[in-house]
Amino acid sequence: MAVTACQGLGFVVSLIGIAGIIAATCMDQWSTQDLYNNPVTAVFNYQGLWRSCVRESSGFTECRGYFTLLGLPAMLQAVRALMIVGIVLGAIGLLVSIFALKCIRIGSMEDSAKANMTLTSGIMFIVSGLCAIAGVSVFANMLVTNFWMSTANMYTGMGGMVQTVQTRYTFGAALFVGWVAGGLTLIGGVMMCIACRGLAPEETNYKAVSYHASGHSVAYKPGGFKASTGFGSNTKNKKIYDGGARTEDEVQSYPSKHDYV
């Protein structure tokens, strides 16, 4: 029950996080005109990853896309790439995690398969969240650098007469959305990985169990295949001690691929 709750919550948190990453990537307000200690203008500039906008006091907003690819700063391209990678990984992770959910039955999928898928989606969510956080942080760092550079030469003029006031940009809403969304995706991924441990068969694995009965013999293999004797349904992953039943390598367990989580 706790595993299902952890997995379900991890899925929901990651879903919200990825929705946030998509929203942040599409938002225009990655950087906004700094209004503090600046001459008051009748226009408000803000920029996103894909276009820059100007909102006038008149109520009109004009947005222009960055129609060049080669002319854009390498840092902006890197941020775009990180955000897109984050979205793609997150989307794949969501797809995988839907099939991995314990509450959803798909054919005769075993718990071990669901555990693998849960772990895979968890890792994808973690990487997706890290990509988003990295992308937003790179952009924020770029803004901070440009902010202090433009502050240093805020007023550029000739002969001492002020000619141009440079527009300074500060953190926009998209950065905060991106940070929070990346964090949520990361947390969701960690929860999925934790849930994976609960889903993985952690009991001792056995090579085979031979049961000697008068009429016939039944072999039990680790993983608990249903036997035709009628009681196979409750032998799944359980030790069998009955009459002449003998377990081989009783104390030996094999390291599972999930043990390192």
Partner: antibody
């Protein structure tokens, strides 16, 4: 058709108050930036106040800040200018205007005359 | 505050003549965000409110004859009337629409010779 009709002007004593109204038709007042502009007897144009489109931010010249207040009533589609502590230099023809691209003043009313005199 | 300096203050012309009115601002009216210059030109005839001619320094308002042309960027702007007509006799104002307070030039009065 866009129409702006100012009212509320008149003769007022120095230190007095006056509220100008602008009845708007042909567009929704909330969607556009609106301003008051005055023209002095010497024909000089002076910007008085602006309320931004789609928002509530207001702007005034430093000389009028605290004395003049621009507001709008979206339900009535009206723009107002509350003037207090009036001085003789506030004597002018007051125009109600709607902002357009480039924050330009595209639509003007016919104006209402405010005379501040003892 | 941004100071808008218009010249000449008055101009006597003959019909068909080319007229140039200059407007200088104390600071650049160019916005880096959209590469537009926030300068507007108005025409005011006696007994009427001002009429918008040109916004964004060079964009002609609809219905304005194409003999009116706005040009310039940064701090130096020009209004050109390619061939003055009798109905163009009026006062022309330039305006800073970028910085608050929004300021106007003193005006240029166009008179017929």
């Amino acid at each position: 058709e866009v129409q702006l009709v100012e009212s509320g002007g008149g003769l007022v004593k120095p230190g007095g108050s006056l509220k100008l109204s602008c009845a708007v038709s042909g567009f929704t007042i909330n969607n556009y930036g609106m301003s008051w502009v005055r023209q002095t007897p010497e024909k000089r144009l002076e910007w008085v106040a602006t309320i931004i489109g789609g928002g509530s931010s207001t702007y005034y010249p430093d000389s009028l800040k605290g004395r003049f207040t621009i507001s709008r009533d979206n339900a009535k589609n009206n723009l107002y200018l509350q003037m207090s502590s009036l001085r003789s230099e506030d004597t002018a023809l007051y125009y109600c205007v709607r902002l357009y691209f480039g924050n330009s003043f595209a639509y003007w009313g016919q104006g209402t005359l405010v005379t501040v005199s003892a | 505050d941004i100071v808008m300096t218009q010249s000449p203050s008055s101009l006597t012309v003959t019909a068909g003549e080319k007229v140039t009115v200059s407007c200088k601002s104390s600071q650049s009216l160019s916005n880096s965000g959209n590469q537009r210059n926030y300068l507007t030109w108005y025409q005011q005839k006696p007994g009427q409110p001002p009429k918008l001619l040109i916004y964004w320094a060079s964009t002609r308002e609809s219905g304005v004859p194409d003999r009116f042309t706005g040009s310039g960027s940064g701090t130096d702007f020009t209004l050109t009337i390619s061939s003055v007509q009798a109905e163009d006799l009026a006062v022309y104002y330039c305006q800073n629409n970028y910085f608050y307070p929004l300021t106007f030039g003193a005006g240029t009065k166009l008179e017929l010779k």
